[in-house]
């Protein structure tokens, strides 16, 4: 365990990291669910999209999200890894031209319509915390992750490495 300062030092390079290619290295269409198997769903309401975390009925179809994966280079002076350090970043798009965005001021996760190149708020560092789960860390705010709060997605500050396995920031990806 390396405590609060360790997590921030470990991820501080996110502020300066650059996406090494404008094209994703791979893309994956998947449904997104929580550690407790609740589905992440998207609904168009009053010309804007809302994001929900809910239990689906047995035969209800899950919403799909296009995950686009990008390589991002650590600046060598930050990572301590020379030119070697790389991170895997992801953008999440549930429908054409809309992407999940981190709103760090409101601690919220929102769907915004935008054109490429996407803003930094649409990029999340992918973490494997658990054998079959992933977590999404804000590129613009190291130590802050997409999480579940009151049946909605929210931004959750994780202040120590022990809390990185907390269930509310763990998500499952599935083709079904």
């Amino acid at each position: 365990a390396f405590g609060i300062s360790g997590v921030q030092k470990y991820t501080r390079a996110l502020h300066d990291s650059s996406i090494t290619g404008i094209s994703p290295i791979t893309e994956y269409l998947a449904s997104l669910s929580t550690y407790n198997d609740q589905s992440i769903t998207f609904a168009l309401e009053d010309e804007s999209y809302e994001i929900y975390v809910e239990d689906l009925k047995k035969d209800e179809k899950k919403d799909k999200v296009l995950l686009s994966y990008y390589e991002s280079q650590h600046p060598s002076n930050e990572s301590g890894d020379g030119v070697d350090g790389k991170m895997l970043m992801v953008t999440l798009s549930p429908t054409k031209d809309f992407w999940l965005h981190a709103n760090n001021k409101e601690h919220s996760v929102e769907l915004h319509k935008c054109e490429k190149p996407l803003p930094d708020q649409a990029f999340f560092v992918l973490h494997n915390m658990h054998s079959n789960c992933v977590s999404f860390e804000c590129k613009t705010d190291p130590g802050v992750f997409i999480g579940v709060k009151d049946n909605h997605l929210a931004l959750i500050k994780v202040d120590s490495s022990e809390n990185l396995c907390t269930e509310n920031i763990l998500f499952k990806l599935s083709e079904t």
């Epitope: 650590h74 890894d81 350090g85 895997l88 992918l126």
Partner: antibody, heavy 122, light 107 residues
Framework: EVQLVESGGGLVQPGGSLRLSCAAS????????MYWVRQGPGKGLEGVSG????????YYTDSVKGRFTISRDNSKNTLFLQMNSLRAEDTAVYFC???????????????WGQGTLVTVSS | DIQMTQSPSSVSVSVGDRVTITCRAS???SSWLAWYQLKPGKAPKL??????SLQSGVPSRFSGSGSGTDFTLTISGLQPEDFAVYYC?????????FGGGTKVEIK
């Protein structure tokens, strides 16, 4: 330059214990997924155990669960594999490896040590 | 656990030939597959990651393709230094499992 150097291998009797070390240099160990892989005589590669950089979560293949323990010492930038209740089928060259990406194992393993030989025999 | 089935187990070829090795996963692994080269007494060398991304420093005669469950490693224009054993590895979820290996031998 990234370097991984394994040590601690040797001859041990069935039921015995060994502790393997992997000294890392040129990068911060805790920032990456680290992985132990073995190759038995005349056999293929087999993943043994991994540890997540971000959370420190640990993972084991079924055949070593309850017998092997992976850990790391961040201050010494060193990875360990404690092997107890060793069996003849654990005889292999053991490699440590570092992930391509920090925070995820999705990209596989880019840097490898030269390996250390563990022989379990009476 | 995800099983990885690699074929062929061995292939005899000449310098300059094109070699194709296939790997099949027992369940969908998206594009999370890596290919390694292993020579006796040496550490494994990463060739391809994320199914088709060429690792830095690896010659462009190596290429990878596929997604889902079926993947291919192609060596076009085999060089003398390419005779080795090649392994696929699913990097989707732990335990990260390897294929049985393909030995590329001189004809």
């Amino acid at each position: 330059e990234v370097q991984l150097v394994e040590s601690g291998g040797g001859l041990v009797q069935p039921g015995g214990s060994l502790r393997l070390s992997c000294a890392a240099s040129g990068f911060t160990l805790r920032s990456y997924v680290m992985y132990w892989v073995r190759q038995g005589p005349g056999k293929g590669l087999e993943g043994v155990s991994g540890i997540s950089g971000s959370s420190g979560g640990t993972y084991y293949t079924d055949s070593v669960k309850g017998r092997f323990t992976i850990s790391r010492d961040n201050s010494k930038n060193t990875l360990f594999l404690q092997m107890n209740s060793l069996r003849a089928e654990d005889t292999a060259v053991y490699f440590c490896a570092r992930s391509v990406y920090s925070t995820t194992w999705y990209g596989g393993f880019q840097h490898w040590g030269q390996g250390t030989l563990v022989t379990v025999s009476s | 656990d995800i099983q990885m089935t690699q074929s062929p187990s061995s292939v005899s070829v000449s310098v300059g030939d094109r070699v194709t090795i296939t790997c099949r996963a027992s369940q969908v692994i998206s594009s999370w597959l890596a290919w390694y080269q292993l020579k006796p007494g040496k550490a494994p060398k990463l060739l391809i990651y994320a199914a088709s991304s060429l690792q830095s420093g690896v010659p462009s005669r190596f290429s990878g393709s596929g997604s889902g469950t079926d993947f291919t490693l192609t060596i076009s224009g085999l060089q003398p230094e390419d005779f080795a054993v090649y392994y696929c590895q699913q990097t989707n979820s732990f335990p990260l499992t390897f294929g049985g290996g393909t030995k590329v031998e001189i004809k």
